[in-house]
């Protein structure tokens, strides 16, 4: 039999990018991430 | 919301050719994997998927009747046509047109009109 | 055509119990893109086919947890973890990794 058509089979996941700054103390300046999906990245 | 409406003419002749109609609403044939099947019942018996047809104009048959079937589509009206030619008394049934988006995480038969009966009287 | 075969014809339920239906297919329904196009729909009487179960296993939107959907290769399952009044109906198993997409012959859900 043929194949019906379909896409690749690969499935795009949306997922969230939040940038964030946190001040962590008076000397110390900030760190500056990237999170994905709940992870930090950068 | 996706709505879809089939019409026919619920009676005709044997050896007459079925014309059926599919007007939708809720999503356009224009977007890209976008799809709408034809499927029957006949009374108190099971489903016989019969084609469809793609965004894009690609169309696909049921092998045992791809002689007989023709589906095609406006999009600008919104609607999927369907004719059967030579049709028989095995051809009453109701008769569905159906949504299938294949570029989506759903990739299935996800709305489906209310049907339409046809009856073939010999 | 891939032949979908459902048994049983007919399931008789309480209310509350679980119910398994089962589907197979005469030859493997996985797709060249590594997906499993089996679906599961539910007729109820007088109405058109709604879809309850995509790709084996996922629950379509709207539809109750107490569906779940397994299997691979040429085996699949339904089940319905507690029958409720709304359940009855007939339920149809699909492929749509061939073509012509088939569907199996049916399984009426009613009460004992």
């Known amino acids: 039999d043929a194949e019906f058509r379909h896409d690749s089979g690969y499935e795009v996941h949306h997922q969230k990018l939040v940038f964030f700054a946190e001040d962590v103390g008076s000397n110390k300046g900030a760190i500056i991430g990237l999170m994905v999906g709940g992870v930090v990245i950068a | 919301q996706v709505t879809l409406k089939e019409s026919g003419p619920g009676i005709l002749q044997s050896s007459q050719t079925l014309s059926l109609t599919c007007s939708f609403s809720?999503?356009?044939?224009?977007?890209?994997?976008?799809?709408v099947s034809w499927i029957r019942q006949p009374s108190g018996k099971g489903l016989e998927w019969l084609a469809h047809?793609?965004?894009?104009?690609?169309?696909l048959y049921n092998p045992s009747l791809k002689s007989r079937l023709t589906i095609s589509k406006d999009a600008s009206r919104n609607q999927v046509f369907l004719k059967i030619t030579s049709v028989d008394t095995a051809d009453s049934a109701t008769y569905y047109c159906?949504?299938?988006?294949?570029?989506?995480?759903?990739?299935?038969?996800?709305?489906w009109g209310q049907g339409t009966s046809v009856t073939v009287s010999s | 055509d891939v032949l979908m075969t459902q048994t049983p014809l007919s399931l008789p339920v309480s209310l509350g119990d679980q119910a398994s239906i089962s589907c197979r297919s005469s030859q493997s329904i996985v797709h060249s893109n590594g997906n499993t196009y089996l679906e599961w729909y539910l007729q109820k009487s007088g109405q058109s086919p709604k879809l309850l179960i995509y790709?084996?296993?996922n629950r379509f939107s709207g539809v109750p947890d107490r569906f779940s959907g397994s299997g691979s290769g040429t085996d699949f399952t339904l089940k319905i973890s507690r029958v409720e009044a709304e359940d009855l109906g007939i339920y149809y198993c699909c492929q749509g990794s061939r073509v012509p997409p088939t569907f199996g012959g049916g399984t009426k859900l009613e009460i004992k």
């Open positions: 790709k084996v296993s």
């Open positions: 809720g999503f356009s044939l224009t977007t890209s994997g976008m799809g």
């Open positions: 047809i793609y965004w894009d104009d690609v169309s």
């Open positions: 159906v949504r299938r988006r294949i570029i989506t995480v759903v990739d299935a038969m996800d709305y």
